[in-house]
Amino acid sequence: SETTTGTSSNSSQSTSNSGLAPNPTNATTKAAG
């Protein structure tokens, strides 16, 4: 899938964690088929 960023947004993060995607893990592998 593709995500495009850079569109204007007024949302704010409610946590102190970065909003970037975490490091990939094999658990995130898409199901075959």
């Epitope: 593709e2 995500t3 993060q13 909003g19 970037l20 995607a21 990939p24 995130t28 592998t29």
Partner: antibody, heavy 118, light 107 residues
Framework: EVQLQQSGPELVKPGASVKISCKAS????????MNWVKQSPEKSLEWIGE????????TFNQKFKAKATLTVDRSSSTAYMHLKSLTSEDSAVYYC???????????WGQGTTLTVSS | DVQITQSPSYLAASPGETITIYCRAS??????LAWYQEKPEKTNRLLIY???TLQSGIPSRFRGSGSGKDFTLTVSGLEPEDFAMYYC?????????FGAGTKLELK
């Protein structure tokens, strides 16, 4: 030792396309997103986007969505960026960089110089 | 997008001196600012991440501070190899954005 080895300089004509490669070594290729960054005198550093090497999910900067295509070849631990419909404004140095969630862009390639000229 | 304003764009100093570079974000980025060093014929080097955490192998004369919108990079006791370009970059949200850079030159 983590290394990102990029392909060599490119001189292409306006309207053409180019594919830049970034071969990773010294770490588990699928464990980190691969990012791409453009450096030009006019705009300094601009983030193009990133790709998840496991799922091939991509996140793009809106500005580069129609310009860049990101792919990976897990068998060779290589990431690729294809740039199309090139103009003089695409002339720049392009970097691949590994992104770690905690540390951000912790390792960079040496850069690939792209010159678009007729 | 988060705009990053970096200053100064140019700085001249001598070995042994202490210098400070500033970056301001257009909105709060929590602690998520990184600093990089760029030198000719070398790959870009991550110095500091998450505002103040020193990357492994980076000398302790490099120090980052700040949170929210205002951040600083301080280099104490400048060494000859420290004269280079420095960039800040927010890693709080997409798209990642960079400051315009600071060129640190020998006075």
């Amino acid at each position: 030792e983590v290394q990102l080895q990029q392909s060599g300089p490119e001189l292409v004509k306006p309207g053409a396309s180019v594919k830049i490669s970034c071969k990773a070594s010294g770490y588990e290729f699928t464990g980190y997103h691969m990012n791409w960054v453009k450096q030009s005198p006019e705009k300094s550093l601009e983030w193009i986007g990133e790709i998840n090497p496991i799922t091939s999910d991509k996140t793009f900067n809106q500005k580069f969505k129609a310009k860049a295509t990101l792919t990976v070849d897990r068998s060779s631990s290589t990431a690729y960026m294809h740039l199309k419909s090139l103009t003089s404004e695409d002339s720049a140095v392009y970097y691949c960089a590994r992104r770690d969630y905690d540390t951000s862009l912790d390792y960079w390639g040496q850069g690939t110089t792209l010159t678009v000229s007729s | 997008d988060v705009q990053i304003t970096q200053s100064p764009s140019y700085l001249a100093a001598s070995p042994g001196e202490t210098i400070t570079i500033y970056c301001r974000a257009s909105k709060s980025i929590s602690k998520y600012l990184a600093w990089y060093q760029e030198k000719p014929e070398k790959t870009n080097r991550l110095l500091i991440y998450a505002g103040s955490t020193l990357q492994s192998g980076i000398p302790s004369r490099f120090r980052g501070s700040g949170s929210g919108k205002d951040f600083t990079l301080t280099v104490s006791g400048l060494e000859p190899e420290d004269f280079a370009m420095y960039y800040c970059q927010q890693h709080n949200e997409y798209p990642l954005t960079f400051g315009a850079g600071t060129k640190l030159e020998l006075k």
